[in-house]
């Protein structure tokens, strides 16, 4: 996990998600996302 | 929640090969994705690779892309690693861990299940 820290004084931690797919629908593969402070992004 | 069983570890020569064996027990096992996890003296459980449900869709560590392949057999409950071309740092303890559908495959707290484990140990 990566971490950074801003000018705000807080740590905000990023970490990789990964995810099938398959279980969001019909597709294979995996589905990469990331999480910033708790919230996944993208 | 679904029973697991490791099997298959062992001491091998660098550049040899292990296939592990996960055995579940539950009726539910194809709700589940399946993922191995190692972890070695001193260091935390880290993410190997994982299979889908359905066991069309795979992922894996950097670490062991090219090298490993994960499997499963739904009819027979089973999970596989084929571990091939091993080096000294992959000797660890093995977990196989059961991930409920939607939840990050690469993370260890999406496991709700886990083995005890077997004991990989790559040396000359």
């Known amino acids: 996990d990566a971490e950074f820290r801003h000018d705000s004084g807080y740590e905000v931690h990023h970490q990789k998600l990964v995810f099938f797919a398959e279980d969001v629908g019909s597709n294979k593969g995996a589905i990469i996302g990331l999480m910033v402070g708790g919230v996944v992004i993208a | 929640e679904v029973q697991l069983l490791e099997s298959g570890g062992g001491l091998v020569q660098p550049g040899g090969s292990l296939r592990l064996s996960c055995a579940a027990s539950?009726?539910?096992?194809?709700?589940?994705?399946m993922g191995w996890f190692r972890q070695a003296p001193g260091k935390g459980r880290e993410f190997v690779a994982a299979v889908s449900r359905s066991g069309v869709s795979t992922y894996y560590a950097d670490s062991v892309k090219g090298r490993f392949t994960i499997s499963r057999d739904n009819a027979k409950n089973a999970v596989y690693l084929q571990m091939n071309s091993l080096r000294p740092e992959d000797t660890a303890i093995y977990y196989c861990g059961a991930a409920y559908r939607g939840t990050a495959i690469n993370v260890r707290r999406s496991y709700d299940s886990w083995g005890q484990g077997t004991l990989v140990t790559v040396s000359s």
């Open positions: 539950g009726r539910t096992f194809n709700n589940y994705n």
